[in-house]
Amino acid sequence: EPPTACREKQYLINSQCCSLCQPGQKLVSDCTEFTETECLPCGESEFLDTWNRETHCHQHKYCDPNLGLRVQQKGTSETDTICTCEEGWHCTSEACESCVLHRSCSPGFGVKQIATGVSDTICEPCPVGFFSNVSSAFEKCHPWTSCETKDLVVQQAGTNKTDVVCGPQDRLR
């Protein structure tokens, strides 16, 4: 009786189980009662990343330099090319099909995580006791100056965008 299901790494064709082609190879001809499945390696700039019965390999992804993309990892016969973005830019999606500028953190916000080729700058609001007076893609929130350690007193309170202003202590006459 012909099989209705096949083992892993096999496929059912013409009422028989044929071996799938291994990653990096494509199907040339199905097996028969007398012959094994015939597979051929993918060509240059092509790949297949699974056990398969594909008759055509997939083209490696093109990292278009006009979009700010460059090759992070060259593709093989079994893996696709991985693109990333040029310095100062990051991917707009996991597939990395285009790039956008890194964001700067506005005054009152500090950098929690510096941007990479695949992720944007992550900003966080400066908590009480900290400030940022610049727009930056790498500066964290800075702590307010401690007037006490300088033998001074606070003359003007700090905010999330400004440092405290220290001044001399009033001397009793």
Epitope: N66, S98, C99, S104, S135, A137, F138
Partner: antibody
């Protein structure tokens, strides 16, 4: 694929002017576009860039003198308060770290 | 800001000859260097990007080399059509959210 600038004309100092770059054959939701200018007989000078998401970056000398914005098919450059020093041919150019596609340019003359 | 020093300002060579143009960056820009050709009344045309990659449709007579701060454009088997002004352009990201696209002063190539 092409880009073309328009809006250049003779203006008096202090009169705001908006130049438009119209693109065809590609999408501004994928590509970044810069504005570059060239004073008569001089070299090229980068002004600023707008990315596919609408984020902008400007040359350090710009200091609010120019603003770049975009719609789905155009990129605008606003010269906020032109001076005679802003007399130049203004080009829009597509690219991220280099510029592979340029428009023919539009001439802005600032004179009293 | 990055400063690009391009030399020479002008060079003359015979048809079939070779011309070498140099560009020096004030700080390291890795391989973020492009070369453009500009003829009078026309926009710049990209020749080389990433220091040595030839742009689409550009003859292999144009060769770019260098990295870091020193870059060279070599034009061999010079043709009359190569008479133009050539510009280098650097891209630099400071890491502080500041972007810089700086052009060299240009080199006029005269073909005899």
């Amino acid at each position: 694929q092409s880009v073309e600038e328009s809006g250049g004309r003779l203006i008096t100092p202090g009169t705001p002017l908006t130049l438009t770059c119209t693109v065809s054959g590609f999408s501004l939701s994928t590509y970044a576009v810069s504005w570059v200018r060239q004073a008569p007989g001089k070299g090229l000078e980068w002004i600023g860039i707008i990315d596919s998401g609408g984020g902008t970056a400007y040359a350090s000398w710009v200091k609010g003198r120019f603003t770049i914005s975009k719609t789905s098919t155009t990129v605008d450059l606003k010269i906020t308060s032109p001076t005679t020093e802003d007399t130049a041919t203004y080009f829009c150019a597509r690219g991220v770290t280099f510029f592979g596609l340029w428009g023919p340019g539009t001439l802005v003359t600032v004179s009293s | 800001d990055i400063v690009m020093t391009q030399t020479p300002a002008s060079v003359e060579a015979a048809v079939g000859g070779t011309v070498t143009i140099k560009c020096q960056a004030s700080q390291s820009i890795s391989n973020y260097l492009s070369w453009y050709q500009q003829k009078p009344g026309q926009p710049p045309k990209l020749l080389i990007y990433r220091a040595s990659d030839l742009a689409s449709g550009v003859p292999s007579r144009f060769k770019g080399s260098g990295s870091g701060t020193e870059f060279t454009l070599t034009i061999s088997d010079l043709e009359c059509a190569d008479a133009a002004t050539y510009y280098c352009q650097a891209y630099y990201y400071s890491g502080g959210g500041s972007y810089d696209y700086a052009f060299g002063g240009g080199t006029e190539v005269v073909v005899k």
